[in-house]
Interface confidence: medium
């Protein structure tokens, strides 16, 4: 098979957007399977047409409606003949157009009067490509060969820059880059104390506008009264916009405020936010818990707990917790140091304990009292009582924060 590209020069140059028809003539084969190849890859589309001129003469067409830069390359056609592939002479297709930008000026944020650079690059074909720079509507540099770097000594207000690329086919304009001025950040807002304990406070806030410069850190200032002596100042890297304040005094009034800084300096402070740390839970367990059995039930008594210091605040009600080995358990809150227990089974052993609470929580549990289901002769108790006394093993004055109906898993209640 004699195979040649008909009517096409070895180099074909077209303008961008123009139609192109490559044709390939095959002679000496009755039914050629003509394939078009571009840069080594078979062209897998239907923009192709095969026309029989005569029994042994075919023309294949590859049709491009509107040539683009991506269509440029080396084309040839090929046919299979007796297991061998025959290849035509190639055509180099060049698509010319106005310059195409490969690098365009980018938006920047710079400090006032600080020097900066902008880059621009464009390519043909046709080459050469020259670059002209614009600042707003004023031409400021060029023509210079592509690529081009514009050095600017500084700006004092937001300014627009663009570049223009020229070649024999015409000119193309780049995107417009805006060079913004950096500024100090705005004050943070929504400053919130998210968690409070007796000695710690968690703080969160929303950053204000960053002044077009990355926020680097925020400072949390703590005083014991707005405008009072600074107790604490914590500098935290951001994000996240949170801070944990440690080692605060319990039951104390504080105020805090926050500011954030970028490379240019700090923002104004946000408004003061007052908060109060929680007091301490009671430190002591009620002492001398004992029981008096009566005909109508069981009376429990214990000694009053006196606050160990002002940080415990006023001590509130007592919390009484009891359980029986049949699984019955309950809890009651009483104001005084005496409680009347009902609803328990006198046939089963009863274990009782008590703690005193305040606004923070319950103090440590008292030593557990076991009330036996039968009398033990010779036990000393108040007159007319039918009370059994048992000294508990492994007595405990540990501080356990009370969780409803979960206290019975503590070791002092286990065998």
């Amino acid at each position: 098979a004699g195979l040649k590209l008909m009517g096409a020069p070895v180099k074909l140059t077209v303008s961008q957007g123009q139609p192109v028809k490559l044709n390939c003539s095959v002679e000496g084969m009755e039914e050629p399977d003509i394939q078009w190849v571009k840069d080594g890859a078979v062209v897998q589309n239907l923009d192709q047409l095969y026309i029989p001129v005569s029994e042994q003469h075919w023309i294949g067409f590859l049709s491009l409606k509107s040539a683009e830069r991506s269509d440029a390359g080396r084309y040839w056609c090929q046919v299979e003949d007796g297991g061998e592939t025959e290849i035509s002479q190639p055509v180099w297709l060049t698509v010319e157009g106005v310059p195409f930008f490969t690098v365009e000026p980018k938006d920047l944020a710079v400090p006032p009067n600080a020097p900066f650079q902008l880059s621009c690059e464009a390519v043909g074909p046709p080459e050469p490509v020259t670059i002209v720079w614009w600042r707003g509507t004023t031409k400021i540099g060029g023509p210079a060969p592509s690529p081009s770097v514009l050095n600017v000594t500084g700006v004092t207000q937001s300014t627009m820059f663009s570049c223009e690329a020229h070649n024999l086919k015409g000119l193309a304009s780049s995107r417009t880059a805006t060079v913004h001025l950096q500024a100090l950040p705005a004050a943070p807002f929504n400053v919130t104390v998210t968690k409070l304990s007796s000695s710690n406070a968690s703080v969160a806030w929303m950053p204000g506008a960053d002044g077009r410069a990355l926020l680097q850190s925020c400072t949390v200032q703590v005083t014991q009264a707005p405008g009072g002596w600074e107790v604490l100042a914590v500098v935290v890297p951001v994000p996240p916009f949170t801070c944990l304040l440690r080692d605060l005094v319990p039951a104390t009034n504080y105020s805090l405020r926050v500011r954030c800084a970028n490379a240019l300096g700090p923002s104004p402070y946000a408004d003061w936010v007052p908060f109060q740390t929680k007091g301490l839970a009671p430190a002591s367990a009620p002492q001398n818990l004992h029981a008096i059995r009566t005909d109508s039930g069981l009376i429990l008594e214990w000694e009053e707990v006196i606050p160990e210091g002002p940080l415990e605040g006023p001590l509130g009600p007592y919390k009484l917790s009891w359980v029986q080995d049949n699984g019955t358990q309950d809890e009651l809150t009483v104001e005084g140091t005496r409680a009347n227990l009902t609803g328990w089974d006198p046939q089963k052993d009863l274990i009782v304990r008590v703690c005193v609470s305040n606004a923070v929580g319950c103090g440590p549990w008292s030593q557990p009292l076991v009330v036996s289901s039968h009398d033990h002769a010779g036990q000393q108790g108040p007159p007319h009582s039918r009370t059994s006394w048992l000294v508990p093993r492994g007595s405990s004055a540990h501080h356990h924060h009370h969780h409803h109906h979960s206290a019975w898993s503590h070791p002092q209640f286990e065998k």
Epitope: K21, Q44, N45, L46, D47, P52, S63, K65
Partner: antibody, heavy 125, light 108 residues
Framework: EVQLVQSGADVKKPGASLTISCQAS????????ISWVRQKPGKGLEWMGQ????????LYGPSFQGHVTISADRSTATAYLQWRSLEASDTAMYYC??????????????????WGPGTLVTVSS | SYELTQPPSVSVSPGQTARITCSGD??????AYWYQQKSGQAPVLVIY???KRSSGIPERFSGSSSGTMATLTISGAQVEDEADYYC???????????FGGGTKLTVL
């Protein structure tokens, strides 16, 4: 004279299989592509796919890939459109179309097409 | 999948100019073809490669393409031009053809 003769109208039940044909004459069958085009009652034209008589190479439209099979028999110059399992939505007129071009002695192709008369396929229970 | 969009209907008086549009994202790179289908008949190729008239088609039929829009123009429409017109083009990938939804031309 180029002629495309299509098989006659057919009525089938859903789930049935069917093959319709398009026999070409008046030209060298292997030189050209044949397309199948569907037209549902009162609706527009839909390109289903095409086959080149020479190498039986096929192309399908996305909506028809896997639903129909296009084939050709060079010895009888016939193109076929086949369904394994018909659905009521397959009720339509089916045209076969021969695509062609000539160079009029030059190297600029002139297009022409020949359409078959169509085969009406009705799928109804 | 790729779509070509046409107006459902266009009406003109005899002798007026009718314009039928077809829009598709690939039309800047792919040629448009136009078919005429009269009631109960098979379609006929009217225009190929955007603007080339098929043999035997009257000169009043012309085609053009700009950007993503192809247009079929009938200058001095006749009553016999009343038909459905379909645009037809390659998908953006170039490996399957697509018809537009069709435009019913009424010549009142």
């Amino acid at each position: 004279e180029v002629q495309l003769v299509q098989s006659g109208a057919d009525v089938k039940k859903p789930g049935a299989s069917l093959t319709i044909s398009c026999q070409a004459s008046g030209y060298t069958f292997t030189d050209y592509w044949i397309s199948w085009v569907r037209q549902k009652p009162g609706k527009g034209l839909e390109w289903m796919g095409q086959i080149r008589g020479q190498h039986s190479s096929t192309l399908y439209g996305p909506s028809f890939q896997g639903h129909v099979t296009i084939s050709a028999d060079r010895s009888t110059a016939t193109a076929y459109l086949q369904w394994r399992s018909l659905e009521a939505s397959d009720t339509a007129m089916y045209y076969c179309v021969r695509h062609g071009a000539s160079t009029s002695g030059g190297t600029i192709p002139e297009y022409y097409q020949h359409w078959g008369p169509g085969t009406l396929v009705t799928v109804s229970s | 999948s790729y779509e070509l969009t046409q107006p459902p209907s266009v009406s003109v008086s005899p002798g007026q100019t009718a314009r039928i549009t077809c829009s598709g994202d690939a039309l800047p790179k792919k040629y448009a073809y136009w078919y005429q289908q009269k009631s109960g008949q098979a379609p006929v190729l009217v225009i190929y490669e955007d603007a080339k008239r098929s043999s035997g088609i009257p000169e009043r039929f012309s085609g053009s393409s700009s950007g993503t829009m192809a247009t079929l123009t009938i200058s001095g429409a006749q009553v016999e031009d009343e038909a459905d017109y379909y645009c037809y083009s390659l998908s953006d990938s170039g490996n399957y053809f697509v018809f537009g939804g069709g435009t019913k031309l009424t010549v009142l």
